[in-house]
Interface confidence: medium
Amino acid sequence: DSSKWVFEHPETLYAWEGACVWIPCTYRALDGDLESFILFHNPEYNKNTSKFDGTRLYESTKDGKVPSEQKRVQFLGDKNKNCTLSIHPVHLNDSGQLGLRMESKTEKWMERIHLNVSERPFPPHIQLPPEIQESQEVTLTCLLNFSCYGYPIQLQWLLEGVPMRQAAVTSTSLTIKSVFTRSELKFSPQWSHHGKIVTCQLQDADGKFLSNDTVQLNVKHTPKLEIKVTPSDAIVREGDSVTMTCEVSSSNPEYTTVSWLKDGTSLKKQNTFTLNLREVTKDQSGKYCCQVSNDVGPGRSEEVFLQVQYAPEPSTVQILHSPAVEGSQVEFLCMSLANPLPTNYTWYHNGKEMQGRTEEKVHIPKILPWHAGTYSCVAENILGTGQRGPGAELDVQYPPKKVTTVIQNPMPIREGDTVTLSCNYNSSNPSVTRYEWKPHGAWEEPSLGVLKIQNVGWDNTTIACAACNSWCSWASPVALNVQYAPRDVRVRKIKPLSEIHSGNSVSLQCDFSSSHPKEVQFFWEKNGRLLGKESQLNFDSISPEDAGSYSCWVNNSIGQTASKAWTLEVLYAPRRLRVSMSPGDQVMEGKSATLTCESDANPPVSHYTWFDWNNQSLPYHSQKLRLEPVKVQHSGAYWCQGTNSVGKGRSPLSTLTVYYSPETIGRR
């Protein structure tokens, strides 16, 4: 209530002779600051004097502190909040009640605190969980109701008198609520810790023993077992006997049931501590253990590996991988059940021993087609040699081998023939399923691996085939060697390089692009007349009469080919000029007379010149000279000259006679 002073501090403090006591304390006075403080030991209220009697351990007044007991007792408080005290050292006779007499200006209060000082250091207290099970982590707590700044202590954990290696966590409390020192140890007990003594030892700062507390661990655990086997190495041969004994070395609580397991599976009707196996077979090889249960659970012994030895069983071969591709690597594994494991292997390829191969595995780094076949093996151990099993088949796959393109036709092949080719191969695995041909053409494949070329071209030079399974193998190309008549026959002028003029030396060449066979004959003809049988036709001095349409023929054993007609043109100056007169060379005056300059020229005459009997050129330049009306004076000899790009030519004189008309004669 509001009429009380309010104090907070531990109710009782514990210490021992020679230690110290630290009393954490807070207060709140009813009014104003503290003016007087007296610490009594076992105070008694005197009704007569209305004061407290008792030993004064400490006193302070407004006038200042009064020394008491050479500062053994210290008031560490203040005038309004803190009332903490320290007694150092503390003595056995300090036990009892401490009275804090507090006075303010108007109010007084006596606060009592119990002090329990023992003759010797009192022991700490170990706290354990209600149940401890093996391998489950627990926290062990050691608690001491003591802590003082002036008197350091330590708590150490021991197991069977030996310091425990686990790290403990120590904490202290010096508060108005509690004063203690506590050590906590996290610990995973094993079954072997059952019944062991754990100690918490109180030590001073120098590690000197002060006191301790001990507990005995009760670690609940499954039964711990030992298995014994006769023979001790647990290696026997078929038909031998084996005895196994199970011994319980520890169980908490007591065990209830016993059983035996082989390879993790319980053996029926085996519920005693002894397992007798008579006339063992290889099937009884395995891992044996005994299992004993209690309320915590089942406990298992270590496993005994019983090895029933026997000679290798018939072997099998495992191939990695079949089918194998030529050039790849392959591994064979010989598998044979045996105990002890086989020490030696004999390998067979197609029934024939493979020397130098005595290991469980055979590795072939580069497989070839002839490696194909049946691989078998025989395993051997100290008890004997196994039988050779059926073996495994190695299939070696490879592209078709020795592929050839074969021409089926009789030779030679002629242009236009039907050619049949076949694609042959020596061996293939897997089987050939298709064929390819080069070059590609719109050709017929009447059956697998056969190619028919209808109307074979002159330029079908080589053909190659490929036989294909999973891979294609190409044959070398085969030459068809198609024979054909000469091709692209044409006439070519070799000389002269420019146009041909009359009198030139002229050579014509009969050209062709190809011929098979190469042996050829030539024929030249003009207007159906044979001119020569050489590749060239030569004219030492060409004349206009040689002009015309020429052809050459080239022959081989297959046939003959003609060129297109080639026109030979000879250029020459005007020749064979003559003057023709129309209507005749005798014309009556007054009529019309036409003189024509006729000529033979190549190119044609481009320019004419007319001359009279006096070789006087006339002002006429066309081919025809027209005199109209013709006069008697026109009578005389005329000639003409023709000119072309090659040259000039002149005609002989032609005489025109103009006679008088009857009228003129009549007038005379």
């Epitope: 030696n344 390998w347 024939k352 493979m354 020397q355 130098g356 191969r357 005595t358 070839l368 002839w370």
Partner: antibody, heavy 118, light 107 residues
Framework: QVQLVQSGAEVKKPGASVKVSCKAS????????IHWVRQAPGQGLEWMGW????????NYAQKFQGRVTMTRDTSIGTAYMELSRLRSDDTAIYYC???????????WGQGTLVTVSS | DIQMTQSPSSLSASVGDRVTITCRAS??????LNWYQQKPGKAPKLLIY???SLHSGVPSRFSGSGSGTDFTLTISSLQPEDFATYCC?????????FGQGTKVEIK
């Protein structure tokens, strides 16, 4: 590297015996058969027989049956060929050889010349 | 016993020539045929095994073919170091047997 080193040349009298040794190195001695082949002067190669160094098993050519003995000592990796009742036509170079898994002779000793002469 | 017959017993050739040696077995030996080269005063050396497989380190100008009873050793372009005696051997069965050899001489 694989090596087959043979003992040195021998000169023997007719009726005597000769024992040629062959020291193998560079491979597992017990893993490969040892074959013995001989070559008379100016003649071709003649197969005499084999020994399996692993088991000690042997196989002799009919011609040498009863006269030839092939043995081995695995502790020192050595094969031996002993030919008894020597005749002058036994004069030859004797080769020890190693036969591979696929039955071809891949390594030959340097040869031992045995001369039988009275 | 399986008889091995080689032909020719000798041949003369020039550097660069293509040379072919044949070997015939008296019964089928599948592909269990090996070829060896021997030079005077030296031990034979393996060239070809299993009829057509080139032994490691042997030049590719050497090749083998055949199966059953007829086998061929071919040297595509004869080199100066190839003048020697060549011998075939069957490894199909015991006793192992050799051909009588073919001597390749310089023409």
């Amino acid at each position: 590297q694989v090596q087959l080193v043979q003992s040195g040349a021998e000169v023997k009298k007719p009726g005597a015996s000769v024992k040629v040794s062959c020291k193998a190195s560079g491979y597992t001695f017990t893993g490969y058969y040892i074959h013995w082949v001989r070559q008379a002067p100016g003649q071709g190669l003649e197969w005499m027989g084999w020994i399996n160094p692993n088991s000690g098993g042997t196989n002799y050519a009919q011609k040498f049956q009863g006269r030839v003995t092939m043995t081995r000592d695995t502790s020192i990796g050595t094969a031996y060929m002993e030919l008894s009742r020597l005749r002058s036509d036994d004069t030859a170079i004797y080769y020890c050889t190693r036969e591979d898994t696929w039955n071809y002779i891949d390594y030959w000793g340097q040869g031992t010349l045995v001369t039988v002469s009275s | 016993d399986i008889q091995m017959t080689q032909s020719p017993s000798s041949l003369s050739a020039s550097v660069g020539d293509r040379v072919t040696i044949t070997c015939r077995a008296s019964q089928s030996i599948s592909s269990h045929l090996n070829w060896y080269q021997q030079k005077p005063g030296k031990a034979p050396k393996l060239l070809i095994y299993a009829a057509s497989s080139l032994h490691s380190g042997v030049p590719s100008r050497f090749s083998g073919s055949g199966s059953g009873t007829d086998f061929t050793l071919t040297i595509s372009s004869l080199q100066p170091e190839d003048f020697a005696t060549y011998c075939c051997q069957q490894s199909y069965s015991t006793p192992r047997t050799f051909g009588q050899g073919t001597k390749v001489e310089i023409k």
